[in-house]
């Protein structure tokens, strides 16, 4: 089905991932579809197989690279089209002029771990994960923490303005169980996007003191 | 804001040229994908022809296949579409349009447009 309402929307992790996500309303499950890209200043072209992930979108990653090898720059515009076989022939159903660094979207951060946990506190670290070193310490984070009796969603959250790997979690109840996720985002871009979350990182703190006010 | 402003349109004789411009400002002119779009008199409005940002991807309506060309400099923020041969059902209010991202879909090229410049009259005579 051709009239039903399309999106095309693909963002590169700033390394050597391309990730795109292509919707059709009405659009048959078993049609097949790719996603062509087309360097302007790159010797290769790349084609991924777009695969269903929901009744009307599918998605595929055009991987240029080993995971940590630098395959785009800021100045690199990559045509992406989104091709679908009709009969013996492949229409184009979306087209784009990709800028990389304009549509970021960063791995999740990985390697969360606690540093130092108290009564009240938590120390907490973690790392980016293959993100580009253009961005020198022009990255911003949001962190939340889950609470026992809460959802998620119902997490405030605690927003870090610059390139720290780290949190210091305070008025913290002892004795009680937590979880706690970061994301990531650069300066960079006007169609950038927050990373997905961290894997959950559950973490308990210390007893209270005995005979001691808390 | 937003604004586009069209220019270029007059009164033509059939078979003859006429190229159209269209100003941009108030947003970054080559992250998104362009059009142009035209209303004939007592008709509704036709798409004609889309860009990419870069310049890179173009397609036509099957009525001016072949006699425009879309093209655009991103250094200037100018959309152009240059019309060869044309002819007295090509008489139309021309406007150039926005897309609302980078992508644009040649199956349905009319959607996805989120502003319109004022327009360019273009009349071509027998």
């Known amino acids: 089905a051709v009239n039903g309402t399309s999106q095309f929307t693909c963002f590169y992790n700033s390394r050597a991932n391309i990730s795109c996500v292509w919707s059709q309303d009405g659009a048959l499950q078993d049609t097949s579809c790719q996603v062509h890209a087309w360097p302007d200043r790159r010797r290769w072209n790349q084609t991924c197989e777009l695969l269903p992930v929901s009744q009307a979108s599918w998605a595929c990653n055009l991987i240029l690279g080993a995971p940590d090898s630098q395959k785009l720059t800021t100045v690199d515009i990559v045509t992406l089209r989104v091709l679908c076989r009709e009969g013996v022939r492949w229409r184009v159903m979306a087209i784009q002029d990709f800028k990389p660094f304009e549509n970021l979207r960063l791995m999740a951060p990985i390697s969360l771990q606690v540093v130092h946990v108290e009564t009240h506190r938590c120390n907490i670290s973690w790392e980016i994960s293959q993100a580009s070193h253009y961005f020198e310490r022009h990255l911003e984070f949001e962190a939340r923490t889950l609470s026992p009796g809460h959802t998620w969603e119902e997490a405030p959250l605690l927003t870090l303005k610059q390139k720290q790997e780290w949190i210091c979690l305070e008025t913290l109840t002892p004795d009680t169980q937590y979880e706690f996720q970061v994301r990531v985002k650069p300066l960079q871009g006007e169609f950038t996007t927050w990373s997905p979350w961290s894997q959950p990182l559950a973490f308990r703190t210390k007893p209270a003191a005995l005979g001691k006010d808390t | 804001q937003v604004q586009l402003v069209e220019s270029g349109g007059g009164l033509v004789q059939a078979g003859r040229s006429l190229g159209l411009s269209c100003a941009a400002s108030?947003?970054?002119?080559?992250?998104?994908?362009m059009s142009w779009v035209r209303q004939a008199p007592g008709k509704g409005l036709e798409w004609v022809s889309s860009?990419?940002?870069?310049?890179?991807?173009?397609h036509y309506a099957d009525s001016v296949k072949g006699r425009f060309t879309i093209s655009r400099d991103n250094a200037k923020n100018t959309l152009y579409l240059q019309m060869n041969s044309l002819k007295p059902e090509d008489t139309a209010v021309y406007y150039c349009?926005?897309?609302?991202?980078?992508?644009?879909?040649?199956?349905?090229?009319?959607?996805?447009?989120?502003?319109r410049g004022p327009g360019t009259q273009v009349t071509v005579s027998s």
């Open positions: 860009i990419t940002g870069a310049g890179r991807g173009t």
């Open positions: 349009a926005k897309y609302s991202s980078s992508t644009y879909y040649p199956p349905t090229p009319a959607r996805g447009t989120d502003y």
């Open positions: 108030g947003f970054t002119f080559d992250n998104y994908a």
